[in-house]
């Protein structure tokens, strides 16, 4: 099943202590999906979308960006035929970077 879209939601972090907000959206025909956020292949957080909506926002409190690993990806799962879980492809990666200090 198709990959979700992924994006950072503003305000963007300006330091490693700032929170990070990552939105993941499934295609329109998959409302109420279960979403998983990964960083460097490791599970960071799981969220379920409301039954009438197709997206979730992962809210990572300050310090999450210090964790080792690569960019963030998300994935969603839905119940298919025979109540079997079907997983989507992974989203494109999204990277979190911080502004270079001006001093």
């Amino acid at each position: 099943i198709p990959a979700p879209s992924i994006r950072l939601v503003p305000p963007y972090p300006s330091s490693q202590e700032d929170p990070i907000h990552i939105a993941c959206m499934a295609p329109g025909n998959f409302p109420g999906a279960n979403f998983t956020l990964y960083r460097g292949g490791q599970v960071v957080q799981l969220l379920q979308a409301p039954t009438d909506q197709r997206g979730v926002t992962f809210n990572l409190s300050g310090g999450s960006s210090k964790a080792p690993g690569g960019p963030f990806h998300c994935q969603y799962g839905v119940l298919g035929e025979l109540n079997q879980s079907q997983l989507s492809d992974l989203s494109e990666p999204v990277n979190v970077s911080f502004p270079v200090p001006t001093w």
Partner: antibody
């Protein structure tokens, strides 16, 4: 349900500092799904975002007001506060505090508002 | 002058459909940032009407709907009612300068 209530003086003298507090009831200010913000509305005019704060203390300010604004949070009291320095008559407005929602694949909407408090800058 | 441009006023008769536009640029709506809409009845605080371009909070009638295309967004109200007479504001994020949440200048809706 969550409610927000602004408090503070309704009259401030020019060049002084405007100080307001927003008390959150019916829910925790420490939820990861929300920022907490201040918005103002001069009489007969539109809305202007002042700034927002996360429970951890991370702040974001309107660039046009940044040099004069400080927003702080007190999680133990479930409150956040606004300080606006060097005020002039142009800062006369209704000041609202609001909750900023992050969820459903979106973010940044002011989903719950206080009733607003009128602040007049005059000598 | 607001970063997001709205018509100062619109009007319609009861039962009609009206739309309110919100025109931005490539640094806000055109950059795919979420658009939110608010209704402000006279003498009251604004109320969230639409968030994330199209999503209605619980309790908001389905007569209200939002859409977005390119650098513009629209709020549509069908089956206009007298109690819809209010000011309406759009809001988004603008990435120019240091980044900022921005509001449109507001649109006064009159029900004839």
């Amino acid at each position: 349900q969550v409610q927000l209530q602004e408090s503070g003086p309704g009259l401030v003298k020019p060049s002084e500092t405007l100080s307001l507090t927003c008390t959150v009831s019916g829910g925790s200010i420490s939820s990861s799904s929300y920022y907490w913000g201040w918005i103002r509305q001069p009489p007969g005019k539109g809305l202007e975002w002042i700034g927002s704060i996360y429970y951890s203390g991370s702040t974001h300010y309107n660039p046009s007001l940044k040099s004069r604004v400080t927003i702080s949070v007190d999680t133990s009291k479930n409150q956040f506060s606004l300080k606006l320095s060097s005020v002039t008559a142009a800062d006369t407005a209704v000041y609202y505090c609001a909750r900023v929602y992050y969820g459903s694949g979106t973010g940044g909407a002011f989903d719950i508002w206080g009733q607003g408090t009128m602040v007049t800058v005059s000598s | 002058q607001s970063v997001l441009t709205q018509p100062p006023s619109v009007s319609g008769a009861p039962g009609q459909r009206v739309t309110i536009s919100c025109t931005g640029s490539s640094s806000n709506i055109g950059a795919a940032y979420d658009v939110h809409w608010y209704q402000q009845l006279p003498g009251t605080a604004p109320k969230l009407l639409i968030y994330g371009d199209t999503i209605r909070p619980s309790g908001v009638p389905d007569r209200f709907s939002g859409s977005k295309s390119g650098t513009s967004a629209s709020l549509a109200i069908t089956g206009l009612q007298a109690e819809d007479e209010a000011d309406y504001y759009c809001q988004s994020y603008d990435s120019s300068l240091s980044g900022s949440w921005v509001f449109g200048g507001g649109t006064q809706l009159t029900v004839l």
